[in-house]
């Protein structure tokens, strides 16, 4: 399977909600010992390998934010932490796999990534992620509402195994 | 602290049922996997039943599948084991653990609770 | 399934001795991701399970250094370099790499 990211740059204003998006394209495995674990997480730019460094999001991990779950079925963090945080990971039965940022800073711009694990009785198979940029811009030059900028057809399907 | 207590064990008949509870406390319950082990009389340790974070995955080995439930209450830090059709091979101390989780792979159970005995036993 | 045998079955030691406890499996328990899921655990009188050694030869945290693990394949081994009283007990070695997950049959670390 691989992870698409269909947008690369969201660039919001202060105060603005924004949903960053990734999602599982391919061949998933629905048998009853198959599981996905997807989670998202902070990185830098100029590394050799993108994504390979993880920073909170927030002050929450990506173990803080993590989904686990069937093939494609619907799940979103339930925990209070992440909600008190004004933050919320969701899958849906499409694989689209998602985390809301609600009222962001200029704090919140940055590389993010998106994980997902194929997991077969608890133990990983596959990984993949996707990485996209979040500007968060304040002034007269900042968009009233969240621009997003589609990925090129080759970055959209990033399949680096992390 | 990390903390797992057990409860629910009692003496049964065979072919009865019995429901185990453990509940969580010192960390984020519904970010880490979690299982049952036993103990048989004799000491050897069985493992029973593991379910994944969010309760959407379980698995059994063939001697308890079909006959053991494993379940877990996220919102009340609890994790269950609803065994049916018990058997006097089933008479053990019944450990829950928390999983060291990287990534969704389980490898390792880093805390134990103290147990909870069931006897079955005409 | 896959089959730990654990020896020796009890193990009499004298304090400030090297202890060796050998785990062998029925067959390879090299996972197709290439970790190898072999585990073990020290259960002291009256208390619960403790883990030890995770994937073969990490300690978890708190563990004492005196505590290494290793081996590979069918054949791991655990070594207690220098036995303490607090070692005394029942070790476990586990499989996860394939299910059902199963453990040995415990070897007993006593005083000579």
């Known amino acids: 399977f691989k992870v698409a990211t269909p947008y690369s740059l969201y660039v919001c204003p202060e105060g603005q909600n924004v949903t960053l998006t990734c999602r599982l394209l391919g061949p998933v495995d629905k048998g009853h010992d198959v599981t996905f674990y997807k989670t998202w997480y902070r990185s830098s730019r100029g590394e050799v390998q993108t994504c390979s460094e993880r920073r909170p999001i927030r002050n929450l991990t990506f173990q803080d934010l993590h989904l686990h779950h069937g093939g494609h079925q619907a799940a979103n963090t339930s925990h209070d932490l992440a909600q008190r945080h004004g933050l919320e990971s969701a899958s849906d039965h499409h694989g689209n796999f998602s985390i809301t940022m609600r009222n962001l800073t200029l704090l919140d711009s940055g590389l993010y990534c998106c994980l997902v694990v194929e997991i077969r009785h608890h133990h990983s198979e596959h990984r993949v992620h996707g990485a996209m940029e979040l500007q968060v811009q304040t002034g007269k030059d900042a968009p009233s509402n969240c621009v997003v900028y589609p990925s090129s057809s080759q970055d959209s399907e990033n399949i680096t195994a992390a | 602290e990390v903390q797992l207590v057990e409860s629910g064990g009692d003496l049964v008949k065979p072919g009865g049922s019995l429901k185990l509870s453990c509940a969580a406390s010192?960390?984020?319950?519904?970010?880490?996997?979690m299982s049952w082990v036993r103990q048989t009389p004799d000491k050897r340790l069985e493992w029973v039943a593991t379910i994944n974070s969010g309760g959407s995955y379980t698995y059994y080995p063939d001697s308890v599948k079909g006959r053991f439930t494993i379940s877990r209450d996220n919102a009340k830090n609890t994790l269950y084991l609803q065994m049916s059709s018990l058997k006097s091979e089933d008479t053990a101390m019944y450990y829950c653990a928390r999983h060291e989780d990287y990534e969704g792979d389980y490898y390792a159970m880093n805390y134990w609770g103290q147990g909870s005995s069931v006897t079955v036993s005409p | 399934d896959v089959l730990m045998t654990q020896s020796p079955l009890s193990l009499p030691v004298s304090l400030g001795d090297q202890a060796s406890i050998s785990c062998r499996s029925s067959?390879?328990?090299?996972?197709?991701?290439?970790?190898?899921?072999l585990e073990w655990y020290l259960q002291k009188p009256g208390q619960s399970p403790k883990l030890l050694i995770y994937k073969v030869s990490n300690r978890f945290s708190g563990v004492p250094d005196r505590f290494s693990g290793s081996g590979s394949g069918t054949d791991f081994t655990l070594k207690i370099s220098r036995v303490e009283a607090e070692d005394l007990g029942v070790y476990y070695c586990f499989q996860t790499s394939h299910v059902p997950w199963t453990f040995g049959g415990g070897t007993k670390l006593e005083i000579k």
């Open positions: 010192g960390f984020t319950f519904s970010s880490y996997g």
């Open positions: 067959q390879s328990i090299l996972h197709s991701n290439g970790n190898t899921y």
